[in-house]
């Protein structure tokens, strides 16, 4: 913490300008009035402060706004944003997409994924839902950031907005997030024709249930292997060999390459070896011919 001293009269600060770069840390602490700093935040980013000096300025703002900065200050943080922790950001209320854009630009190239995720979360809370303008801003300024949102936040996306989401925006989404987004996508694209529908729904399929995957297998979609590998394990396991063959079309070749990886490995273990042999790919590890399969889960459910 910067030790408290009184400000020498000749160092008194009446406006935020370049002369401040020559101030020592304790002089900044003593001479810069927090209210003045907040009022002239738009000037700070143009001044080449050192990281140590920025620490002092942040400390001033923290003292002035212990409950969190107002948006008028947040919008002009500039490189001072790099000093913020997720805990700091959690106190903010942000509604302006201009603020979001400005801070996303600043964070580019810095290891700030936690801060950015918290910032986006605050924007969604501040705006009440993840609307189209917010999604457009995220896809334009922070590809992949959509997946930093929790499933709870993503549940506020209206289906009408889903069309603005690009495949690359979902690359880092986990199963729980896709579980939330998939039903919305299904609704959003429901009036499209078969092939067009598949192109649109494909990035969301990591959240699809078995019955939807089975339905796709009847539509000659030729699902690529990367998409198949992202399907939920629970959605893949009940598929028959014939269904997987229809689903993948010529991409069925790839099963051999992914033989040791989930969900392919787990699926193989559930198939009869005879059935796997019909693919002709040399897949091994299926249930040997002549073995009886007892589904004990059914008996447990009844008892």
């Amino acid at each position: 913490d910067v030790e408290r001293t009184t400000c020498p009269p000749e160092k008194e600060v009446h406006e935020i300008d370049e002369s401040l770069i020559f101030y020592k840390k304790r002089e900044l602490e003593a001479c810069v009035d927090a209210a003045l700093l907040a009022a002239q935040m738009d000037r700070v980013d143009a001044i080449p402060f050192t990281y140590e000096q920025l620490d002092v300025l942040k400390h001033k703002l923290d003292e002035l706004y212990p409950q969190g900065y107002p948006e008028s200050v947040i919008r002009h943080l500039g490189h001072l944003f790099l000093k913020m922790s997720p805990e700091d950001i959690r106190k903010w209320n942000v509604t302006s997409l201009e603020t979001l854009k400005a801070l996303l630009k600043v964070s580019k190239g810095h290891e700030m994924s936690a801060q950015v995720a918290t910032l986006i979360d605050r924007v969604v809370v501040g705006r009440g839902q993840l609307d189209k303008d917010t999604v457009d801003t995220l896809t334009a300024f922070c590809p992949g950031c959509l997946c930093s949102l929790s499933p709870e936040r993503l549940s506020s996306v209206p289906p009408s907005v889903i069309g603005a989401v690009r495949p690359q925006d979902l690359d880092t989404c986990g199963p729980r997030q896709l579980d939330v987004l998939y039903p919305k996508a299904r609704l959003a694209f429901q009036n499209m024709s078969g092939s067009e529908y598949f192109v649109k729904i494909r990035p969301f399929l990591g959240g699809a249930p078995t019955e939807d995957v089975k339905a796709l297998s009847q539509q000659n979609v030729s699902m690529d292997l990367a998409t198949f590998m992202k399907l939920r394990r629970e959605a893949v396991l009940p598929l028959t060999v014939a269904e997987v063959q229809k689903l993948l079309g010529p991409h069925v070749e790839g099963l051999k390459v992914e033989e040791q990886h989930s969900p392919v490995r787990d699926w193989i273990l559930k198939q009869r070896q005879d059935d796997l042999d019909t693919l002709g790919l040399g897949l091994q590890g299926g249930i040997p011919n002549g073995y009886l399969i007892l589904d004990l889960s059914v008996r447990e459910a009844l008892s």
Epitope: P250, E253, D277, G280
Partner: antibody, heavy 114, light 107 residues
Framework: QVQLQQPGTELVKPGASVRLSCRAS????????MHWVKQRPGQGLEWLGN????????NYNEKFRNRATLAVDKSSTTAYLQLTSLTSEDSAVYFC???????WGQGTTLTVSS | DIQMTQSPASLSASVGETVTITCRAS??????LAWYQQKQGKSPQLLVY???TLAEGVSSRFSGSGSGTQFSLKINSLQPEDFGTYYC?????????FGGGTKLEIR
């Protein structure tokens, strides 16, 4: 030992037919498609077709569809390529190949000559 | 049918050099491509499958890359045993056409 065994040579007359064999051993014959590939002297490789020993499904290169017939005998783990109405253009080495490409037969040199 | 165009048709290089052979598919074949090496009077041998996966027992001097329609096989630090003819073959449905081959000769 994992291998595909093919006879070294076959000599037949123009207009006749020939059946080339390929005996698989050391692996589960039913688990892989079997492919056939043709190579004329000094030329590149040409895919003829493939057969699935489990289902009997067959795919042919259109160019050979009318004169080539693929078959398998699961009991002897042997694949067959039959060629009819032979001409000198059919003189070539014929390879059988396991689906994954790891395993090739040594090839049968077919000579069509009167 | 998918056409495979391989280049160059022939190539001469010295031991120790690095060479690259390319293969172009007439349509998207994703990563379903294999590379083979064939020596005079012998059966072809699998080098690379699924565009970039090295087959068992193949020297790490060989490497495959590419996806979609453009692929290449790179051979680092050529050894005497590397000389022969190289073929690409797509593995995306049938017919499984081969490239025309690249004959790699000792300079």
């Amino acid at each position: 030992q994992v291998q595909l065994q093919q006879p070294g040579t076959e000599l037949v007359k123009p207009g006749a037919s020939v059946r080339l064999s390929c005996r698989a051993s050391g692996y589960s014959f039913s688990s892989y498609w079997m492919h056939w590939v043709k190579q004329r002297p000094g030329q590149g490789l040409e895919w003829l077709g493939n057969i699935n020993p489990t289902t009997g499904d067959i795919n042919y290169n259109e160019k050979f569809r009318n004169r080539a017939t693929l078959a398998v005998d699961k009991s002897s783990t042997t694949a067959y390529l039959q060629l009819t109405s032979l001409t000198s253009e059919d003189s070539a080495v014929y390879f059988c190949v396991r689906h994954d490409g790891f395993l090739w037969g040594q090839g049968t040199t077919l000579t069509v000559s009167s | 049918d998918i056409q495979m165009t391989q280049s160059p048709a022939s190539l001469s290089a010295s031991v120790g050099e690095t060479v690259t052979i390319t293969c172009r598919a007439s349509e998207n074949i994703y990563s379903y491509l294999a590379w083979y090496q064939q020596k005079q009077g012998k059966s072809p041998q699998l080098l690379v499958y699924y565009a970039k996966t090295l087959a068992e027992g193949v020297s790490s001097r060989f490497s495959g890359s590419g996806s979609g329609t453009q692929f290449s096989l790179k051979i680092n630090s050529l050894q005497p045993e590397d000389f022969g003819t190289y073929y690409c073959q797509h593995q995306f449905g049938t017919p499984r056409t081969f490239g025309g081959g690249t004959k790699l000769e000792i300079r």
